[in-house]
Each structure stands twice: as C-alpha cells, then as structure tokens.
C-alpha cells in the first residue's frame, strides 16, 4: 500500500456539478491526476483534471451539463475513481460508489441585498443559487452578521430552520457598518454539508435622529 | 461504530484455495466499499482488493489480478476473500477494513482484528 494517508471526498450541487478533492500525504504535486465518473443509469460518463489547491489536496469539478439543467436523481449512483498517471499507465488510486443526494453540497445563496435598513434593524433577502426542485421547502439557512471589532468567526449563528430567503436583524446599533453572511443545506442526504457562505454584504444601520428617542 | 472480525485464515499449500470471511456489524454496512490488505512480517499493510458498496465495483492488486476474489452479500453483513493458487508470497496477516471509498493507504476508518494466511511450499 502507499505510505501515509488520503482521502477522496465529493459533493453533489443538486444540479449538474459535482465537486472532487483528492489528497494524499507525499504525492508529488507534478502528478497527473484526473476524477472519472461513471454512473450505472445514465448514457454520459465524465471526467475532471485534479489541480493542485495545497501541498498535498486536488480538486476539480465534474461538470454534468447547464448549470440549472437536473443531471441525477435520488436513485442514481456515481462510481468515481481518482487515476494518476504512472509513466506510460494510470494507476488507480481511490474508487468510491457516490449516491449523489447523501452527499450534497449546495452553492452559496447569492444576490444578498438589504429590503429595508432602520437604525437597530435590517431586513436582508438573498436567493439560492442552482438549487434542485427537489427539495421543494426542506432547506434551512445558517446566518451570520460581523459586528465592529469582532471576527466572523465569533459572530453568534443564527438558524433558520425552514426555506426563508430573508431575515430581520434586530437589536442593531445606531449609524454603525456591518457584513452579513449567510449558508443553506437540504435537510436530505447522511454526508451533505453545508454551503460555502455567501459573499459578505456590507451595510449600514442608520443614525439616531437627534434629540429623539429610538 | 463498526466492528469487522475476520475468519478462513490457515495453512494452505502452495496452489492450494482459502476462503476469507468479514462479518460487519454496527452501523449499516450498505453504506461502506470494503477491502482486504494483508501484512506479512516487516513489511507495510497493503491492500489485496476492494469492493464498492452499491455497483460492486472491484480493485485488485496486480500481485493477486486473477487469483483472487472479492465480493459481498449485503443482505449478510459479510464481505468475502476468494484466494485460489495460493503461492508462499501470499502469506501474511489479513484484515478486512471498512470506508467510505477504496482508498491504496493504509488508513481506512475501520479495521479487523486480522485472520492469518501461511502458504507452505
């Protein structure tokens, strides 16, 4: 066996991409290594170049066809293989059976845009992105706001355990800037994971009118 | 958890069969690709062959390609080990090891207590 460890995990969009990380303790990061993906009920087989993300991780995305196009189903299984090549041969170097919906793995929600900002309050709405129509309401969202002189990752989560494509911030301070984030994941599914999050939206709270209470 | 004992390990002549067996209990084994390695004394775990757990897929090493056979019976919880012309090369401590994909390193998330498999000449 080859020293070390490794591993080889893959996410399903829930559309038309599945996304592949391969690493392995020593492997030489020249090494020519690609994800084939063969699935028992379909006509299509597919293949993605692993490019190296760090010292010793590849990844690529198997792109199954348009982006909103609904390429798998809940009955279908992948089988994907990482093959390196070996001088003249490929070698195989991990095989796993993907049942694409118990691996899921959403992209982050976009178009993040405040609906209404007071001085202690915000109104935010955002959209999924490529989300399949099978999940109909079985979704639920993780939020997050960066407050001044905090990180994101001491920023207090927020869930939402329903498909709610909106949240009231409350409890703002006055004429103060803020960021939020915000991640989904299906309910469905014994390996999914959540989204990336979303891209911070940057706003700010308006300031106390003078002389009044708010 | 998952816990695999393996059993079919013995003294076999050269050219002789084995049949290796991994009872699985514990979580649900539907959900693991299986595999056989084997260590002989001051060598490295090697992998001997892997079964995927839906399609069946197979791997084999190139030192056992067409005298060994892997398979599973999902509806048992076994996955077994078919060693025909066994050669004295073969001998070693077999482990059966459960993960989420066959992976050519050792570090797969559940392993056997190991069955041993002496080919004399």
């Known amino acids: 066996a080859v020293n070390g460890t490794s591993q080889f995990t893959c996410f399903y969009n829930s559309r038309a991409n599945i996304s592949c990380v391969w690493s392995q303790d020593g492997a030489l990061q020249d090494t020519s290594c690609q994800v084939h993906a063969w699935p028992d009920r379909r006509r299509w087989n597919q293949t993605c170049e692993l490019l190296p993300v760090s010292q010793a991780s590849w990844a690529c995305n198997l792109i199954l066809g348009a982006p909103d196009s609904q390429k798998l189903t809940t009955v279908d299984i992948v089988t994907l293989r990482v093959l390196c090549r070996e001088g003249v041969r490929w070698r195989v170097m991990a095989i796993q059976d993907f049942k694409p919906f118990e691996n899921l793995r959403l992209m982050a929600p976009i178009s993040l845009q405040v609906v209404h900002v007071e001085t202690h309050r915000c109104n935010i709405s955002w959209e999924i992105s490529q989300a399949s129509h099978y999940f109909e309401r079985h979704l639920e969202f993780e939020a997050r706001t960066l407050s001044p002189g905090h990180t994101w990752e001491e920023a207090p989560l927020l869930t939402l355990k329903q498909k709610q494509e909106w949240i009231c911030l409350e409890t703002l301070t006055p004429d103060t800037q803020y960021e939020f984030q915000v991640r989904v994941k299906p309910l469905q599914g014994e390996f999914t994971t959540w989204s990336p999050w979303s891209q911070p939206l940057a706003f700010r709270t308006k300031p106390a009118a003078l002389g009044k209470d708010t | 958890q998952v816990q695999l004992q393996e059993s079919g390990g013995g003294l076999v002549q050269a050219g002789g069969s084995l049949r290796l067996s991994c009872a699985v209990s514990?979580?649900?084994?539907?959900?693991?690709?299986m595999g056989w390695f084997r260590q002989a004394p001051g060598r490295e775990r090697e992998i001997v062959a892997g079964?995927?757990?839906?399609?069946?897929?197979?791997y084999y090493d190139d030192s056992v390609k067409g005298r060994f056979t892997i398979s599973r019976d999902n509806a048992k919880n076994t996955v077994y080990l078919q060693m025909n012309s066994l050669k004295p090369e073969d001998t070693a401590l077999y482990y059966c090891?459960?993960?989420?994909?066959?992976?050519?390193?050792?570090?797969?998330?559940?392993w056997g207590q190991g069955t041993q498999v002496t080919v004399s000449s």
């Open positions: 090891a459960a993960d989420r994909s066959i992976k050519m390193t050792a570090d797969w998330a559940y």
């Open positions: 514990g979580r649900s084994f539907r959900n693991y690709v």
């Open positions: 079964i995927t757990q839906f399609t069946s897929t197979t």
